[in-house]
Every structure is written in structure tokens, then in C-alpha cells.
């Protein structure tokens, strides 16, 4: 029962996480104009992975796609790639995990197959979550670097009279969505891997059996032999399941509130 719950919860958490990764990837607010130094601007700029937008004080918003592939920074391309890989792996993981769910019966699928599928989807979720976290972190690092670079030459004076205020960008909402979503997908993946341990049939060690050869009183004790050796044992192969008991170390909990600077 606990295995089913762990697997189901892992699936739901991963589903939410992957939905979040997709949302973050599509969002326009990966970086938003820093208003600390220019709180009086009547034009607000923000950028996503696919387009940049400008919102005027009237509420009119204008977005322009990045209609170039080669002209974009390598880091932005890398972030795009990481997010897409995360989504693809997550989507495949979801597909696999649906069939692996213990509560869903598909034909005569053995529990060992379900265990393998659960483990596969779990690993996929973990890699998917890591891809998202990595992608968001790379972008955040890029923002921090650019922020301090633009701060260094914030005002480029022209004869001391004319000032050109450089637009600085800070963390947008998509970064926080991405981090949380990546974390959830990762947690979901770990839960699936834990559930897999409970689903996997353990190998049965058979007790020593005495074989009496006619006319001899010698007892053979094939202690190390498994059922697969076929030594005429009457013992039936029994699939032994872990009842789902978990040590405290294995209990998964949601992350507490994070303070982002």
C-alpha cells in the first residue's frame, strides 16, 4: 500500500514539476528590468528564452521574437537546450510511469517489469529536474554577471552633459518557477526510485535441503544454490515484496520556503 502511495505521489509531484518546467520555458519573464536605479521609467522591459517584451505605461505590450539562431549568445542556446531536454525527458518519464503505476493493470505485465519502468521513469525525472535546475541556474549566473558588468559602466557620460542609462536586468518570475519545478521533478524522481525498490521482487534464498542417496547416509547441503538450479526442491518460488516500510532517512519531504536574494 505504501509503495503504491509513494509511486503515485512521485508521479503527481513529477507531473506538477514538469508542467512547471514547461511553463517556465514558455514564460517571457526570465529577466526583468531592474527598477532599483530607475524606478521612474515609463517603459518596462523583460525577456524570455524566445522573445523580448516591452510594456508601456498605457499597458500596451509589444513582444519581438529572437528571429535568429546564430546571432544569439551561446549561453542562451545552452539554456534553451537544457530546458528542452528536461521537458522531453520528463514527458517520456511521465509516459513510462503511467504504465508503471501499480494501480493500473495492463495485460499480464509482471511486477518486475513495472519495477524496471518505475526506476526508468524515476531516473528520467531526476535528470529532467537536474536539467531544469541547471538551465535556470546558468541563466541566473549570466544575469548576475551582466548585472555587475552594466553596473560598472552604468552611466556613460558624453561631455558630462548627456547620460545614457543602461538597462539592467534582474531575476524574473520564470527563474523561480523553474527552480521550484525542477526541484519538484527531482523529488518526484527520487520517490519513484524509492517506490521501485518496493516493487522489485527479491531473490529467494532457499534453506538447506537434505538429499538422501539410496544406501548412503550422506546429507548434501547445497546452501548457496538458488531455486534456479533446479535441485528437485518442493519449495515454490515466492515473490517477496517489501511492504513499503521506510526508514526515516528515506522519507521525502517538500522543501521549505527559500529566500532568494
Amino acid at each position: 500500500m505504501a509503495v503504491t502511495a509513494c509511486q503515485g505521489l512521485g508521479f503527481v509531484v513529477s507531473l506538477i514539476g514538469i508542467a512547471g518546467i514547461i511553463a517556465a520555458t514558455c514564460m517571457d519573464q526570465w529577466s526583468t528590468q531592474d527598477l532599483y536605479n530607475n524606478p521612474v521609467t515609463a517603459v518596462f522591459n523583460y525577456q524570455g528564452l524566445w522573445r523580448s517584451c516591452v510594456r508601456e505605461s498605457s499597458g500596451f505590450t509589444e513582444c519581438r521574437g529572437y528571429f535568429t539562431l546564430l546571432g544569439l549568445p551561446a549561453m542562451l542556446q545552452a539554456v534553451r537546450a537544457l530546458m528542452i531536454v528536461g521537458i522531453v525527458l520528463g514527458a517520456i518519464g511521465l509516459l513510462v510511469s503511467i504504465f508503471a503505476l501499480k494501480c493500473i493493470r495492463i495485460g499480464s505485465m509482471e511486477d518486475s517489469a513495472k519495477a524496471n519502468m518505475t526506476l526508468t521513469s524515476g531516473i528520467m525525472f531526476i535528470v529532467s529536474g537536474l536539467c531544469a535546475i541547471a538551465g535556470v541556474s546558468v541563466f541566473a549566473n549570466m544575469l548576475v554577471t551582466n548585472f555587475w558588468m552594466s553596473t560598472a559602466n552604468m552611466y556613460t557620460g558624453m561631455g558630462g552633459m548627456v547620460q545614457t542609462v543602461q538597462t539592467r536586468y534582474t531575476f524574473g518570475a520564470a527563474l523561480f518557477v523553474g527552480w521550484v519545478a525542477g526541484g519538484l521533478t527531482l523529488i518526484g524522481g527520487v520517490m519513484m526510485c524509492i517506490a521501485c525498490r518496493g516493487l522489485a521482487p527479491e531473490e529467494t534464498n532457499y534453506k538447506a535441503v537434505s538429499y538422501h542417496a539410496s544406501g548412503h547416509s550422506v546429507a548434501y547441503k547445497p546452501g548457496g544454490f538458488k531455486a534456479s538450479t533446479g535441485f528437485g526442491s518442493n519449495t515454490k518460488n515466492k515473490k517477496i515484496y517489501d511492504g513499503g516500510a521506510r526508514t526515516e532517512d528515506e522519507v521525502q519531504s517538500y522543501p521549505s520556503k527559500h529566500d532568494y536574494v
Partner: antibody
Amino acid sequence: EVQLVQSGAEVKKPGASVKVSCKASGYTFTSYIMHWVRQAPGQGLEWIGYINPYNDGTKYNEKFKGRVTLTSDKSTSTVYMELSSLRSEDTAVYYCARLGFTTRNAMDYWGQGTLVTVSS
Amino acid sequence: DIVMTQSPDSLAVSLGERATINCKSSQSLLNSGNQKNYLAWYQQKPGQPPKLLIYGASTRESGVPDRFSGSGSGTDFTLTISSLQAEDVAVYYCQNDHSYPFTFGQGTKLEIK
């Protein structure tokens, strides 16, 4: 047709307050921000502030902060500009002007103006 | 605050001739996000409210004759009237639409020579 009709001329004593109204018609009132601009006799234009009738959000010129209050009444599609602690330098024509939606923050329609005279 | 400086203060041009008014801002009005300039030009005739002529530094407002044109980028802008007509006699103002408080130039009075 978009129209902004302002209230009539006012004569006030120093230290008093004045409330000028601007009635909008010919468009969806809550969809456009309304700015207030003043012009002293023979002088240039000076921006006072704006109000967003949709959520009553306001932004004021620091020069007028604490003395000016912008309000709106959705039921009558009217915006109001109240200026307190009047001084002789506040003698000017006060205009309400609608912020265009796609005009790069420029004001596309203006009221006819309200002359406020501050004199003892 | 962004300071807008217009030149000249007054201008006398013959009918049919070209009139040019300049406007300089103390900070760039070019927005990096969309590469648009946030500057407007207004015309004000005696006893009337200002009328929007040009926005975004170069886009003519609907209904404005095509003899009016705007140009420039960053901090330097120009309003040009290609062929002056009698009804163009007015005071012209440039306005910063990029940052609050919105600021106007001191105005340029255009007269017929």
C-alpha cells in the same frame, strides 16, 4: 468621438484648494490612463501626474506630491484633480489628457483646459 | 529629471519653406528593449490645448498632414515641416515619454516671415 470636457474656470485665494473635473466620453473610460498637465500664463507645459481609472493607481510629479490628489469616478467616467495649499504660482490652465494606447506613452486627446487663478 | 531643451526659441519661416525645430534631452530616450525612442511632438495654437503630432520620435499621429515629420534618436531629435502653411503658426513642444516625470521642452514659437 473621444471627448474630454473639463469644468469651468476657478478663482481661489492662497492657501485654499481647488478641484477640477474632467468628464470622458467616446471610449471605454477604464481602459485609458488620464494625465494632468498645467500651463502657467505665457509659459511651457508641466506634467502633474496620472491616474489609472481601472485600478485608481496614481503617479505624481515629486514637485506636487502631498499637494495634489487624483481621483476617478467610474460611474460618471470622470477624473478629478485636487490641488491644495494654493499659491500664486499655481495660477495656470490645467489640462487633462488621455494617454494613447499605442502612442509610445504620448497623450493623444486633451481637454479644453480649466483656468485656475490664485489671487488674494 | 530629464531636461528637454528646444532650439531655437522662436523661428520665422516663409510660406512654402522648410521649418526645422530641434530638441535635445539630457538622457537618452531610446529604449534598449525595443529600440524605440520615447519622444513626442505637440502643436499648440493660441487659446487651444496641445495637439499630438508625432510620437515615438518619428510616427505621425493619424490625421496629421504628411508635411510634418520627426527624426532623430537617443538624445537629439528634429521636427520638420517640409512646406510651411499659414495654419502651422503655433508653439511646438517636444516631450520626454520615457521616464517620469514626463518633461516638456520650453517650446518653439513658429511664425511666418
